[in-house]
């Protein structure tokens, strides 16, 4: 079956990193510089992505895979495959169309990206405030006052490495 298919379509034999060159009797030709083919049987090679300006190269283009970009310091990736770089703000700020803006009282942002969010209202979930909120941190809710009997202690677990708003790079 494989032999039959290749007789019908010689291009199916061309591996990744090459293309089926119609100008040369459908011979498998290597992808030219600054281009790639990530799958076999391709009739053209794709142009490599170039990481320019605020983008920087995370992974160089090869004959079989596209370049990957990330952002220069002070910016973070947005969109599929880091299609955009967005300005970082400080914790306690949010990025608006007019630039970075401090969070209003009663809101926080513990990221360099994203919005200022209202502090959690612990009482709505039947809990009490253990630690007050700041511009950079949400309140910490604990058990409701009724749950805190003598001898009971409330332990706040350590924060995980990544908070919402950070995309894996």
């Amino acid at each position: 079956f494989e032999r039959t298919r290749s007789l019908q379509d010689p291009c199916s034999n061309c591996p990744a990193g090459t293309f089926c060159d119609n100008n040369r009797n459908q011979i498998c030709s290597p992808c030219p510089p600054n281009s790639f083919s990530s799958a076999g049987g391709q009739r053209t090679c794709d142009i490599c992505r170039q990481c320019k300006g605020v983008f920087r190269t995370r992974k160089e283009c090869s004959s079989t895979s596209n370049a990957e970009c990330d952002c220069t310091p002070g910016f973070h990736c947005l969109g599929a495959g880091c299609s955009m770089c967005e300005q970082d703000c400080k914790q306690g700020q949010e990025l608006t169309k007019k630039g970075c803006k401090d969070c209003c009282f009663g809101t926080f942002n513990d990221q360099k990206r994203g919005i200022c969010r209202p502090w959690t209202n612990c009482s709505l979930d039947g809990k009490s405030v253990l630690v007050n909120g700041t511009k950079e941190r949400d309140v910490v809710c604990g058990p409701s006052p009724a749950d805190l009997s003598p001898g009971a202690s409330s332990v706040t677990p350590p924060a995980p490495a990544r908070e919402p708003g950070h995309s894996p790079q």
């Epitope: 169309k97 919005i115 959690t120 709505l124 979930d125 949400d138 809710c141 908070e163």
Partner: antibody
Framework: QMQLVQSGAEVKKPGASVKVSCKAS????????MHWVRQAPGQGLEWMGW????????NYAQKFQGRVTITRDTSASTAYMELSSLRSEDTAVYYC?????????????WGQGTLVTVSS | SYELTQPPSVSVAPGKTARITCGGN??????VHWYQQKPGQAPVLVIY???DRPSGIPERFSGSNSGNTATLTISRVEAGDEADYYC?????????FGGGTQLTVL
Amino acid sequence: QMQLVQSGAEVKKPGASVKVSCKASGYQMRGYYMHWVRQAPGQGLEWMGWINPNSGGTNYAQKFQGRVTITRDTSASTAYMELSSLRSEDTAVYYCAREGEAVGLDLDYWGQGTLVTVSS
Amino acid sequence: SYELTQPPSVSVAPGKTARITCGGNNIGSKSVHWYQQKPGQAPVLVIYYDSDRPSGIPERFSGSNSGNTATLTISRVEAGDEADYYCQVWDSSSVVFGGGTQLTVL
């Protein structure tokens, strides 16, 4: 493949409570806020609230405060929305949706929806 | 609380351009996101941050936002674009959706 899979349809009596689940796969649940949005038959989208899966911090739309509780179990990569004191007007499709990364808060992936019918 | 106003319905012939508006006080200062919802399906994000397209969304979908109006534009409309479209913003403590616009392809 990023996916949010919700629990099945529910029929409840007025005054009862319902708890809908939303299991996340294909991404690190701790990294993204989870929202709940509902849609009554023939009506538009109505935001209910969010949870920070990392800390458990929540924010609820004023309309639902006191009746809705959003929780999560990160070990099971699952978020929950419980709505109490149900009335007929709560008949709706309930969606979970992952918050994206755009400026100003977008919802980039949605569950398939859970129909909750409140009827005596 | 912040309100977003959309026309209930918009009709367009195949191949033509559809424009769906979303009105709000000084909406140009906010980031607007647009969702497409087909009958019996969950919403799908088609435009974020006023004018950016998620991967997989055709280039025919575009957005703009200034002053008191944001606009979703669908060029070369196809029968498969028939759906409800919702705009959405974040306003200080809540997520706000427009009432939705039903796009009919004639």
